[in-house]
Interface confidence: low
């Protein structure tokens, strides 16, 4: 059979080369002389020439030693052709598997590995993992299977077997109790990796195990009592820095302090954070303090570490007395945001509302008012009473200043304290609609055919709100109803414009009057382009080229030629003779009734 089983060839073969591997043989060689060839990477494509075949015998040859670590498998194709070059067999798969030799030793991925473990941990605690790799095969052979071991440990305190290494994973673990950072802060292990699962070549590296500090000292406040003065109303104000000492390793989790307010802050006015460099507790205001409500706060602050205590330790507490200093406070509008309904278009001088502020201070201070932001300039405010009046025309439909029927104004109140303070309020005027806009059709330009015209549907928009909108009514004015009809649909929100008499191709003004539910009327001129066409149209087509009939093709061509000649002559005549005054558009259009065939030539 024209089949070859996979061929296994060891890497680094000594030869002699070329070395015979296997013979390709086609049973078609009884009928004709067969020539054999091979193709594929390793034969005729890179790396070329590793394999060859004896053309006439079919012996597959290896020309040089193989390196499994470069290429582990070659996939070639065997071919058999007759003397005339005709293929006598389908290409045959030839798989050459390169088998491994132990020609690489293990290599640690680092010269020095670093790991750490807490002092006092129990035996069995994992410290770190080291890795060595071997380029040889570890699946079908032991050549690339690495076994790990510890060769030596320095120092040998409290004894020389403090650690063990898992022979296959390289995980280093604690094997004995007694790790004490204060006595031995670091161990150096010489580790080995040996291939052939421990029976082959060996390589070494160093594993440094750092013994980490356990939290066996509590932080202590120095001093334990603090007193501070803070102005009222200030948020984020630094009240006090609290200092602690800790005997554990500086900048470690066992040394870094964590502060908590454990008493005296029922109103949740304060917060305490740890300063990243000094390890101090920074006490700040989370909310503004109110002198009028409480002029002194006594806080109790507790300190622990980022790491939990390793042994039972007492927790230190400090006392902070906070005195609140009185300051002049800004007036506060009541409410801070006021919603008022007012009809649009009210007369100038008409009152809108009264908007006043209260002063939180205990003294009776005088408050004066003014408008801070009035984008359209529609309002004025009495400085003493806070009375807001209209000085311009409030327009609900003004899209530049009004959003969702609301006009937003910002007002200011100022007290007469020393120094004076100000507060702001927001006035939201909800503008009530009046029927001050008539309905408008959209679009205001249409294009329509003068034969079998499609009805033009125009949308009706009215800037006012219901009930000052639909249903709408439509009426044609200025004799537009002679040629056109206008009807409002059942829903009353669109108007349908139809051509009822034939008009020649031209542009016409259609006078359309629309009125809303409140009888507010609006006259709009629609620009109608009438085209010589049937049915639907976007833009007017070119001039007509003959009758409606479908005559013979010869007659059609002659007709076109005649039309073109007439058009050229007509063009010259038009240039020479001055044009006659055109008749009124509608008069001229009335000559032919709608539905007739329009045969005028529009040169």
């Amino acid at each position: 059979d024209w089949v070859v089983a996979p061929i296994s060839v060891p890497e680094n073969g000594k030869g002699p080369f070329p070395q015979r591997l296997n013979q390709l043989k086609s049973n078609k060689d009884r009928d004709t002389k067969i020539f054999y060839s091979i193709t594929g990477p390793g034969a005729d494509s890179p790396p070329e020439g590793v394999f060859a075949v004896e053309k006439e015998t079919g012996w597959l040859l290896l020309n040089k030693p193989l390196d499994r670590e470069e290429i582990a498998k070659y996939e070639l194709f065997g071919h058999a052709v007759s003397e005339n070059g005709a293929s006598v067999e389908d290409p045959m798969n030839i798989s050459i598997i390169v088998t491994d030799q132990n020609d690489h030793k293990p290599k640690f991925t680092q010269d020095t590995f670093r790991g750490s473990v807490l002092e006092g941990v129990l035996p069995g605690t994992s410290v770190m993992q080291v890795t060595a790799t071997d380029e040889d095969d570890a699946i079908y052979t032991y050549n690339g299977v690495v076994a790990y071991s510890i060769h030596s440990q320095e120092p040998k305190d409290p004894h020389d077997l403090m650690f063990t290494i898992h022979r296959s994973t390289g995980t280093i673990s604690v094997i004995s109790s007694g790790l004490d950072r204060e006595k031995v802060p670091e161990y150096t292990l010489t580790i080995q990796a040996t291939d052939m699962d421990g029976d082959g070549s060996t390589t070494t590296a160093v594993a440094v195990v750092e013994i980490l500090d356990a939290n066996d000292n509590a932080p202590m406040f120095e001093p334990q009592k603090y007193e501070a003065w803070v102005p009222e109303n200030e948020v984020g104000h630094e009240v006090q820095r609290l200092t602690v000492t800790d005997l554990d390793v500086p900048n470690s989790p066992a040394w870094r302090a964590t502060y908590h307010i454990v008493g005296g802050d029922d109103g949740d006015h304060f917060t305490i954070t740890t300063h990243p460099e000094t390890n101090q507790g920074v006490l700040t205001t989370k909310k503004g303090l109110d002198f009028e409500a409480q002029d002194q706060h006594t806080l109790y602050v507790e300190v622990t570490n980022e790491a939990p205590f390793a042994v039972k330790l007492p927790t230190a507490t400090a006392t902070v007395v906070v005195h609140v200093k009185d300051v002049n406070e800004a007036p506060v509008f009541v409410p801070p945001s006021k919603v008022v309904e007012v009809q649009e278009g009210i007369p100038t001088g008409e009152p809108v509302c009264v908007y006043t502020a209260e002063d939180p201070d205990k003294e009776n201070q005088k408050i004066s008012y003014r408008i801070l932001r009035d984008p359209a300039g529609w309002l004025a405010m009495d400085p003493d009473s806070g009375q807001v009046t209209a000085v311009g025309t409030l327009d609900r439909e003004d899209e530049q200043f009004v959003r969702n029927n609301i006009y937003e104004v910002m007002v200011l109140a100022m007290d007469n304290g020393s120094p004076p303070t100000t507060g702001t309020g927001t006035l939201l005027l909800t503008l009530i609609d009046v029927n001050d806009h008539g309905p408008v059709p959209e679009p205001r330009q249409i294009t329509i055919c003068n034969q079998s015209p499609v009805r033009q549907v125009l949308n009706i928009t009215d800037k006012d709100l219901s009930p000052h909108t639909s249903p709408f009514q439509a009426q044609l004015t200025d004799d537009s109803d002679i040629y056109w009809t206008a009807e409002v649909n059942e829903e009353g929100d669109t108007v349908v414009l139809s051509l009822k008499k034939f008009l020649k191709q031209d542009t016409y003004d259609v006078h359309l009057s629309l009125s809303d539910h409140g009888n507010k009327e609006q006259l709009t001129v629609i620009r109608a382009t009438v085209c010589d066409c049937h049915g639907h149209v976007e833009t007017c087509p070119g001039p007509w080229k003959g009758g409606s009939g479908g005559g013979g093709s010869g007659a059609g061509v002659i007709a076109v030629i005649v039309v073109v000649v007439i058009a050229i002559v007509a063009g010259i005549v038009v240039l020479v003779i001055s044009r006659k005054k055109r008749m009124a558009k509608y008069e001229k259009a009335e000559i032919k009734e709608m539905g007739e065939m329009h045969r005028e030539l529009n040169a």
């Epitope: 030793k105 991925t109 010269d111």
Partner: antibody, heavy 121, light 107 residues
Framework: VQLVEQSGAELVKPGASVKISCKAS????????MNWVKQRPGKGLEWIGR????????KYNGKFKGKATLTADKSSSTAYMQLSTLTSEDSAVYFC??????????????WGQGTSVTVSS | ELQMTQSPASLSASVGETVTITCRLS??????LAWYRQKEGESPQLLVY???TLAEGVPSRFSGSGSGTQFSLKINSLQPEDFGNYYC?????????FGAGTKLEIK
Amino acid sequence: VQLVEQSGAELVKPGASVKISCKASGYAFSSSWMNWVKQRPGKGLEWIGRIYPGDGETKYNGKFKGKATLTADKSSSTAYMQLSTLTSEDSAVYFCARQRDYGALYAMDYWGQGTSVTVSS
Amino acid sequence: ELQMTQSPASLSASVGETVTITCRLSENIYSYLAWYRQKEGESPQLLVYNSKTLAEGVPSRFSGSGSGTQFSLKINSLQPEDFGNYYCQNHYGFPFTFGAGTKLEIK
């Protein structure tokens, strides 16, 4: 910070040899391959070969066998390349470049600044 | 020997544009292809290895893709510092061949 520092420019006569160096710092020199790459003026990059300083294992591009010899000194974290029997074709900038692992997984991530070798009589 | 065809040989683009450079190989190298940028008078800088892994410190506007014999490097929103020569490199089989390079110039 990983650094690969190369020796200065060399002007050598045809037929002579030159040895250029590459000093590494900031990483495990012994367990990373050091590659050497050639670049002729205005041309592309050509891989010469690589050395594993841990045990001196080398791999060469066939084109440079007999031309380049790669060595390494672990104690000084320095890799060397000697170019012999120089001709004008050897005039180029030679870069050394670290390869983080000795398998196929990694490319050359830290490069020296290059050493210019000019062969002229 | 493994053949590498890098295209285009040169490319002109403006800051903010997106460009793509391709690298075609004569045989399968799986995903083991790297991309480097070399500015005039400087050493090459590793951008991408293993076809699509960004090297440390390389901005995310660079992205590599492909496997087998067809690879590409895409640079989104070109910055002034992105101009220079770009090389692809096989880091699978010996010898570690480089592409002929693509010169990316400012338009």
